[in-house]
């Protein structure tokens, strides 16, 4: 899976697992680099059976409902150096029982686009700006929908922003 994010935005790398029984959490690690034989290379965040037990910086946090198996990694205010493969490793107890997910994060330079001129009394086809409160660093996260041909860079039909169990879907309609 590939995720494309602009410099300065927050990146969200999804990872989920199903709990055997409610509250029966499983240790998870997130690391930079493809999943190695065990653990995660260059760990950026780790959970134990209760909570986040380690993270290298406050730029990393879990964005979903961790207690329901949503261990989506959020990376705040991304830079070009954040590009690369990330490993989500769900350490399901047992012999060689881990679930491993490699996700590719591509960081693009921030794009400066002039705001389109709209005729007076008209409204955009859909909101140009969506703002959601975020449970990572205390900040407001802003997602701008771009109306240009580079929209094809977005590889998925719907980007999901997860905020404490609430899912907001922004559907991108391709106009060429």
């Amino acid at each position: 899976e590939e995720y494309i994010v602009e410099v300065g935005q927050n990146a969200y790398l999804p990872c989920f697992y199903t709990l055997d029984t409610p509250g029966n959490l499983v240790p998870v690690c997130w690391g930079k680099g493809a999943c190695p034989v065990f653990e995660c290379g260059d760990v950026v965040l780790r959970t134990d059976e209760r909570d986040v037990s380690y993270r290298t910086s406050s730029r990393y946090w879990l964005n979903g409902d961790f207690h329901k198996g949503n261990v989506t990694l959020a990376i705040g205010n991304v830079t070009l150096e954040d590009s690369g493969i990330y490993c989500c490793r769900v350490q399901i107890p047992g012999i060689m029982n881990d679930k491993k997910f490699n996700l590719k994060l591509v960081i693009k330079p921030a794009k400066v686009t002039p705001a389109p001129t709209l005729p007076r009394d008209s409204t955009p086809a859909f909101p140009r700006m969506l703002t959601t409160e975020d449970h990572g660093p205390a900040e407001t996260q802003t997602l701008e929908i771009l109306h240009d041909k580079n929209l094809t860079q977005l590889s998925t039909l719907a980007n999901e922003l997860q905020d404490a169990g609430t899912t907001i879907r922004i559907h991108h309609h391709h106009h060429h």
Epitope: V26, P27, G33, V37, F38, E39
Partner: antibody, heavy 117, light 109 residues
């Protein structure tokens, strides 16, 4: 200073059992995966088993799967290897190693296991 | 997974450079940046010299360097010294931990 001290090796008959221990100090034991690596006399290195930070996930080489069991006690900073149904080809020096994510940055001095009748 | 392939031995004079190769497949060496190198003196425990293909742990002299091309990883010792005489093992740690058969480095003279 990181120290890993193995114990529990010795002479055992084929089919017998042995339990190796590794006492760790000088680092936060509960924050690292741990592993066992062995070396038969005059031969190269062979990875045997590893265990995750929490101890819930374990990993084994095909040659020992079903016979060996790795475990850890984070409260005692100790790693274990329970070896059952031992064979002559299990004869080796067994090293305890701090495993990170697959490379071993600290090793003990090893304990010799000899399987012979 | 079968063992990685290393030359049985290499030699060089003090001050020279020697390179040890370690050949695997696209599933291990070629597919990931997960290769390590260990030095082992007779009767001693192995010592980590390189990890993640080219990273050097603190305390390892910068005469030791690692690289990779395709399915082959290499360890280069530049400015060979007498104490470098030892066995060297490569290892891959992508899907499983696999070691090479080992290379004996001899310092001539």
């Amino acid at each position: 200073e990181v120290q890993l001290v193995e114990s529990g090796g010795g002479l055992v008959q084929p089919g017998g059992s042995l339990r190796l221990s590794c006492a760790a100090s000088g680092f936060t034991f509960s924050s690292y995966a741990m592993s066992w690596v062995r070396q038969a006399p005059g031969k190269g290195l062979e990875w045997v088993s590893a265990i995750s930070v929490s101890g819930g996930s374990t990993y084994y080489a095909d040659s020992v799967k079903g016979r060996f069991t790795i475990s850890r006690d984070n409260s005692k900073n100790t790693l274990y290897l329970q070896m059952n149904s031992l064979r002559a080809e299990d004869t080796a020096v067994y090293y305890c190693a701090k495993a990170n994510w697959g490379f071993f940055d600290y090793w003990g001095q090893g304990t010799l296991v000899t399987v012979s009748s | 997974q079968s063992a990685l392939t290393q030359p049985r031995s290499v030699s060089g004079s003090p001050g020279q450079s020697v390179t040890i190769s370690c050949t695997g497949t696209s599933s291990d060496v070629g597919g990931y940046n997960y290769v390590s190198w260990y030095q082992q003196h007779p009767g001693k425990a192995p010592k980590l010299m390189i990890y993640d293909v080219s990273k050097r742990p603190s305390g390892v002299p910068d005469r030791f360097s690692g690289s990779k091309s395709g399915n082959t990883a290499s360890l280069t010792i530049s400015g060979l010294q007498a104490e470098d005489e030892a066995d060297y093992y490569c290892s891959s740690y992508a899907d499983s931990v696999v070691f090479g058969g080992g290379t004996k480095v001899t310092v001539l003279g």
